[in-house]
C-alpha cells in the first residue's frame, strides 16, 4: 500500500489545524551507513538463547504496509547443550512505533497516525520463583 496526494475534494493542510492535517513526504532516506548496516545482525534470531522467528505482517491500509515482527520460538530458553532450561523464560522485546492507517470512511488517501506495538526480538530472563511463607 502507498500514500499518494489527496484529491482536490479532500481537505488540505491550509484549511485545518496544522496538527490535524499535515503533508508528509514519504521518501525514505536510508541514513544508516553501509558499514553500520553490514554490522546489523540477522543471525541473532538463531544464535540467541531465546531464539525467535520473524513473520511478515502485511496491512495494505497501513504505511508502512510491511512490518517484520518477531515471535519467541519457545516459552523457555535454550541452554549450552541446546536443551530447554525450565528455570529461564524467553520473553518478547516489544517496541512502540508510529504508523499511518488509512481512514476508509473518509477520503481514500486520508491517513491517521496510530501507535503499534511490534515484537523486535526475544531475550532470556530468570523465572519468577514464589516461595511459600
Amino acid at each position: 500500500a502507498v500514500l499518494i496526494p489527496q484529491s482536490s475534494v479532500c481537505p488540505n493542510a491550509e484549511a485545518n489545524n496544522f496538527l490535524q492535517n499535515v503533508k508528509v513526504n514519504l521518501k525514505v532516506i536510508n541514513s544508516l551507513s553501509s558499514k553500520a548496516s553490514s554490522r546489523r545482525p540477522s543471525d541473532y534470531l538463531n544464535r540467541s538463547t531465546s531464539p525467535w522467528t520473524l513473520s511478515r505482517n502485511e496491512d495494505p491500509d497501513r504505511y508502512p504496509s510491511v512490518i517484520w515482527e518477531a515471535q519467541c520460538r519457545h516459552q523457555r530458553c535454550v541452554n549450552a547443550e541446546g536443551k530447554l532450561d525450565h528455570h529461564m523464560n524467553s520473553v518478547l522485546i516489544q517496541q512502540e512505533i508510529l504508523v499511518l492507517k488509512r481512514e476508509p470512511e473518509k477520503c481514500p488517501f486520508t491517513f491517521r497516525v496510530e501507535k503499534m506495538l511490534v515484537g523486535v526480538g526475544c531475550t532470556c530472563v530468570s523465572s519468577i520463583v514464589r516461595h511459600a511463607s
Epitope: N30, L32, S38, S42, L45, P64
Partner: antibody, heavy 119, light 107 residues
Framework: EVQLVQSGAEVKKPGASVKVSCKAS????????FHWVRQAPGQGLEWIGV????????AYNQNFRDRATLTADKSTSTAYMELSSLRSEDTAVYYC????????????WGQGTLVTVSS | NIVMTQSPATLSVSPGERATLSCKAS??????VGWFQQKPGQSPRLLIY???NRYTGVPARFSGSGSGTDFTLTISSLQPEDFAVYFC?????????FGQGTKLEIK
Amino acid sequence: EVQLVQSGAEVKKPGASVKVSCKASGYTFTDYEFHWVRQAPGQGLEWIGVIHPGNGGTAYNQNFRDRATLTADKSTSTAYMELSSLRSEDTAVYYCTRFLTYEGYFDYWGQGTLVTVSS
Amino acid sequence: NIVMTQSPATLSVSPGERATLSCKASQSVSIDVGWFQQKPGQSPRLLIYHASNRYTGVPARFSGSGSGTDFTLTISSLQPEDFAVYFCQQDYSSPYTFGQGTKLEIK
C-alpha cells in the same frame, strides 16, 4: 549501479535439489527485501517467497512452503533460493528481484536462471 | 489468492498507433499494481508502479490508470521496440500475483 547477478543454468533429475544464487551490488544489501519469482516456459510469473537480509525473516507462497528455502549471506551480499524434491513441472526460469518495502514495488531483477528438470 | 486477469491475450497494433491493455483483479487491490515489459530471453522491466506512476527512465508514451479492480496500461504511439509481452502484478497482499500477460505484436 544496482546489479543482481544470478548463477548459471542447471540441469537436475527429478527428486534432486537445486540452489540458485543472486549476488547484489551497487546498494546496501541489508536494506531491501529479496523476492524470488519463477516463469515456466511460455507461462506467466509465479511468486515463490521473500527474504529480508537485514533481519533474516522469510515468508513463502503456500505452494512452495514445504520445498523452497530462502537464505542470505551478508558477507558476500548474496541471496539463495533452494528448491528440493524437484519435478518436471519445476522446469522454469527463476528470477530474484529487489522489493522496495516502503515504496512497495519491484525495481531491479536478476537476469534469470534456467532450471531444467529431466530424467 | 488474488487472481489478476489480463486481456486481450494477444493484441495486434500498427507502429504509431495507440495500444490499450487491460488487467482485472479478483478483489480490490487499491492502487497496488505494477506493469512490466518482457522481451524474449530478458527479465521483466518495471514500467509503471502504484497503478499510474511511471518508473525512472520509462518513456512518457507509457501511462497507467485505474484503482480497485480495473487497471489499464496505455502506450500512446507504439514504437518498434515496444512489441513485447506485458504483465500486470499486484503487491497488495501476498502471495503477490501476476497476470498471464498480453502479447503485443506488430499488425
